[in-house]
């Protein structure tokens, strides 16, 4: 049997027999455009496509609309996979979204959404989420219903302010809302009372900036 040489996501990579964590090249069906993504082949059954990771503050997340569209950073470290790829991928079949969080006290938590997709660029990559479970809060820290994506040069939030400029980073801001996983990275002991940090309100409350975050997706099967 001929080995499949192009994969749309890490679930396909996993099913092809590649079961080691690492960076893989993904290609959407009917496309020649490639992206490099980190695949988590160990967490919860394997085959997770990492679409965002924060871990050490090495990458600047205060980026433009275009940069968030195409992706930036290092897939082995801190990075954003890219709104366009994720939008196209999540509109081809049903995906789940898992958000894994770490605080500075050694605790970990997660939020799992049973259905996740992004609208097209014409609709500002609006986020759509359904069915929250997990340990990082009973209420969704991503405002529901979902908001349009905003960046420092594309103000699509519901605020009279510019949330992305005020809080830094591109995110699905409301006015401005209970989360921002793309905010400023603050080191330990400087991570409290921060208005523009890495925020997941319904786990750690206001002003607490997290140590690490990972957003990962996988087909719902």
């Amino acid at each position: 049997k001929e080995e499949q040489i192009s994969f749309r996501d890490c679930a396909e990579v996993f099913k092809s027999g590649h079961t080691t964590n690492g960076v893989y090249t993904l290609t959407l069906p009917n496309s020649t455009e490639e992206v490099k993504a980190y695949c988590d082949m160990e967490a919860g059954g394997g085959g997770w496509t990492i679409i965002q990771r924060r871990e050490d503050g090495s990458v600047d997340f205060q980026r433009t609309w275009k940069e968030y569209k195409v992706g930036f950073g290092n897939p082995s470290g801190e990075y954003w996979l890219g709104n366009e790829f994720v939008s196209q991928l999540t509109n081809q079949q049903r995906y789940v979204l898992k958000i894994h969080l770490k605080d500075w006290e050694g605790n970990e938590a997660y939020s799992l959404y049973e259905h996740f997709y992004l609208s097209s660029e014409e609709l500002n990559y609006r986020i759509h989420l359904k069915g929250l479970t997990g340990t990082a809060g009973k209420i969704s820290s991503i405002s529901q219903p979902g908001n349009d994506f905003s960046t420092k040069d594309a103000d699509n939030d519901k605020c009279i302010c510019k949330c992305s400029q005020m809080l830094t980073g591109g995110w699905w801001f409301d006015a401005c809302g209970p989360s921002n996983l793309n905010g400023m990275y603050y080191p330990q002991r400087q991570n409290t009372n921060k208005f523009n940090g890495i925020k997941w309100y319904y786990w750690k409350g206001s002003g607490y900036s997290l140590k690490g975050t990972t957003m990962m997706i996988r087909p719902a099967d």
Epitope: K158, C161, C176, P178, N193, Y201, Y202
Partner: nanobody, 134 residues
């Protein structure tokens, strides 16, 4: 560094009054809305009232409307919560908190309102205890 210091809490009989004060420092007072939240034992924290001194926007929880009044003194960088006709169910720790006044929707501005959603507030004081006995 942002600091919010509450005072004025204490014990009072039902029907009595208290005035809480929140002294703010470390930021431009006029650029922020100040909120009061409370948390009773075993209950979720809830919004009580807020004020934006720059435009006088206020908001009150339904449970305190007509009984509590919020006001600010910009010269002293202080916000006051006058609590009248107190009830046993007002017993809680009361927290003062701050959020940039611009962090509002156009609809809120039109309605002259500030946030009572606690996730919008970045800075919190240590709290002051209010006990109302019957």
């Amino acid at each position: 560094e942002v600091q919010l210091v509450e005072s004025g809490g204490g014990s009072v009989q039902a029907g009595g009054s208290l005035r809480l004060s929140c002294a703010a420092s470390g930021f431009t007072f006029d650029d922020y809305a100040i909120g009061w939240f409370r948390q009773a034992p075993g209950k979720e924290r809830e919004g009580v009232s807020c004020i934006s001194s720059s435009d006088g926007s206020t908001n009150y929880a339904d449970s305190v409307k007509g009984r509590f009044t919020i006001s600010s003194d910009t010269a002293k960088n202080t916000v006051y919560l006058q609590m009248n006709s107190l009830k046993p169910e007002d017993t809680a720790v009361y927290y003062c908190t701050a959020v940039p006044a611009t962090r509002r929707t156009p609809q809120m501005v039109d309605a002259n309102m500030c946030w009572l959603a606690e996730y919008e507030y970045d800075y919190w004081g240590q709290g002051t205890q209010v006990t109302v006995s019957s």
